[in-house]
Amino acid sequence: IWELKKDVYVVELDWYPDAPGEMVVLTCDTPEEDGITWTLDQSSEVLGSGKTLTIQVKEFGDAGQYTCHKGGEVLSHSLLLLHKKEDGIWSTDILKDQKEPKNKTFLRCEAKNYSGRFTCWWLTTISTDLTFSVKSSRGSSDPQGVTCGAATLSAERVRGDNKEYEYSVECQEDSACPAAEESLPIEVMVDAVHKLKYENYTSSFFIRDIIKPDPPKNLQLKPLKNSRQVEVSWEYPDTWSTPHSYFSLTFCVQVQGKSKREKKDRVFTDKTSATVICRKNASISVRAQDRYYSSSWSEWASVPCS
Amino acid sequence: RNLPVATPDPGMFPCLHHSQNLLRAVSNMLQKARQTLEFYPCTSEEIDHEDITKDKTSTVEACLPLELTKNESCLNSRETSFITNGSCLASRKTSFMMALCLSSIYEDLKMYQVEFKTMNAKLLMDPKRQIFLDQNMLAVIDELMQALNFNSETVPQKSSLEEPDFYKTKIKLCILLHAFRIRAVTIDRVMSYLNAS
């Protein structure tokens, strides 16, 4: 058993049928010695008396808010949560496996630049009685500071019969140098509590590996005289690291017809313009990627050919 | 990524082309190592990220773009001093800091070159003959060093008398390649920045 926060405790259980569970001793936070009784949740049934209460915690029915009283007055509370270990592996019931970029990916994180700011998100089908708490650091043995905000519900989607909820959090490394060569990964730890179930999820990454630039901005077409060709131009996104001559991007320009089956013409360039043939009803899209370290491509910025 | 490669203008900063080749070569070598050594811990998540140039050179700090010198987090100690006379310094704009930067890059390349050559000698003794260093990568390191053209004492190639542990050597190869790729990215950024300025 360990303390998650004041008066909230996590009991770690080897989770299998007929498991013996864990013996837990609760102590009433009071100078009183006599006349103390214990109850669980809203029940008035007295579980025991005395300054300490010894319980055998086996299942969720044994978890909850234990309260010690004296003469009708509440003295203190202890909330017991359960953390299930199933055959040597901590349970992952609360969050959905996003399966991208690989199986058992519960937290996904992205950064728009090298400033040390990043966003993480996760999915669940649970809509109520759910709380998250996020901590982060650079390295784990001698951790350096990363400050995270509160996790917020950022999207709701319908997936078949189920509703899916997306939560996200923004974090910022306290003293980040955009040009630094990372040797220690960022660690992100999310505590999730659903009713009386506790779970924790972690992700470890280098900022360089989660970079995904914003799409190029100010995408414009300029027709070339006496030609079906157009000059496409764009600019670096505002959120990208500066100077751009140091943090350079490379671009992919795509001409896509109305039909998804039509052949796509693609050009790769390091410049912020390109000359392409604009077909009728086609659209031109441009996306960006770090020129020197191949992390994710940005989403496409698009304009119609007409 | 197999993308069309632009050839640099003749007037371009002479080292840019070499640094682009270096990044391409080390990235290819790392990809080859990860595929060949699939049963070894060779991915970024599995290896320890060591930097053989730590406390010996200070490339990131010496080559910091002017725009980032206002960022206190970027200004670690710059204690290392280097010899300055290099042929990449083709323009009158060359400052002491630029010379320091380029000579730090040269020192990095020299250190990695020695490590890679020593390691290749060990790998050639492996009866499994599983993996060797790409000669193209070694040649590209050499070309960039020549383009930088700094006078510096030659570091003797390390020779070891004990029987090599090939498992450890292959893991060290992965560690070195990951670190060198990160340094090659920094070198490419620096060359691109110097070329633009």
Partner: antibody, heavy 115, light 112 residues
């Protein structure tokens, strides 16, 4: 004490269907994940499928994906394996089993796919 | 499709020490714990070892398990006639959990 009693095995022709059941008692069935494991005659153990405690997630071996469906009825304390498009290579003893560091196995039920 | 490799058979005389190996990889045994089962003819498997080296109550102490790197082993010190059975190791792969990964199985024969 924990008990898993299996039923539903038998002889079936290729291409036909069969449903296996596993009745649980002696524990809170709705709190634990469950597996199906099979063993072809004279061969080793092969995992078939898993279902979460609440039925929210199901996992299958590639060899049965799209043909077998694992399900559970927590109100009846029963686990099921619906097997469709049966093939000769599905002939085996099928076991249900609890998920956890200490596990309990059913007695096994024989499924024979033969024309 | 077995990822965990065991020797097909091992044998020993009563009282001898018999060991069975189970060889896997970084993503299974290297990452997760190992279990060992004993299966007597015509019966369901019985758990002998869980968590690499833990014995459930009721399992004789002549059975012991260990794990090192990407391999595990089961030792029977002072093998007895009633130990003649098939033995299976089991683990999980970090990418496909909760799918059970079983070893190929080892037939233990107790001679004469």
């Amino acid at each position: 004490q924990v008990q898993l009693v299996q039923s539903g095995g038998g002889v079936v022709q290729p291409g036909r269907s069969l449903r296996l059941s596993c009745a649980a008692s002696g524990f809170t069935f709705s709190s634990y994940g469950m597996h199906w494991v099979r063993q072809a005659p004279g061969k080793g153990l092969e995992w078939v499928a898993f279902i979460r405690y609440d039925g929210s997630n199901k996992y299958y071996a590639d060899s049965v994906k799209g043909r077998f469906t694992i399900s559970r009825d927590n109100s009846k304390n029963t686990l099921y394996l619906q097997m469709k498009s049966l093939r000769a290579e599905d002939t085996a003893v099928y076991y249900c089993k609890t998920h956890g560091s200490h596990d309990n196995w059913g007695q096994g039920t024989m499924v024979t796919v033969s024309s | 499709s077995y990822v965990l490799t065991q020797p097909p058979s091992v044998s020993g005389t009563p009282g001898q020490r018999v060991t069975i190996s189970c060889s896997g990889g970084r993503s299974n045994i290297g990452y997760n714990t190992v279990k060992w089962y004993q299966q007597l003819p015509g019966t369901a498997p019985k758990l002998l070892i869980y968590g690499n080296d833990q014995r459930p109550s009721g399992v004789p102490d002549r059975f012991s398990g260990s794990k090192s790197g990407t391999s595990a082993s089961l030792a029977i010190t002072g093998v007895q006639a009633e130990d003649e059975a098939d033995y299976y190791c089991q683990s999980y792969d970090r990418g496909t959990h909760p799918a059970l990964l079983f070893g190929t199985g080892t037939k233990v024969t107790v001679l004469g």
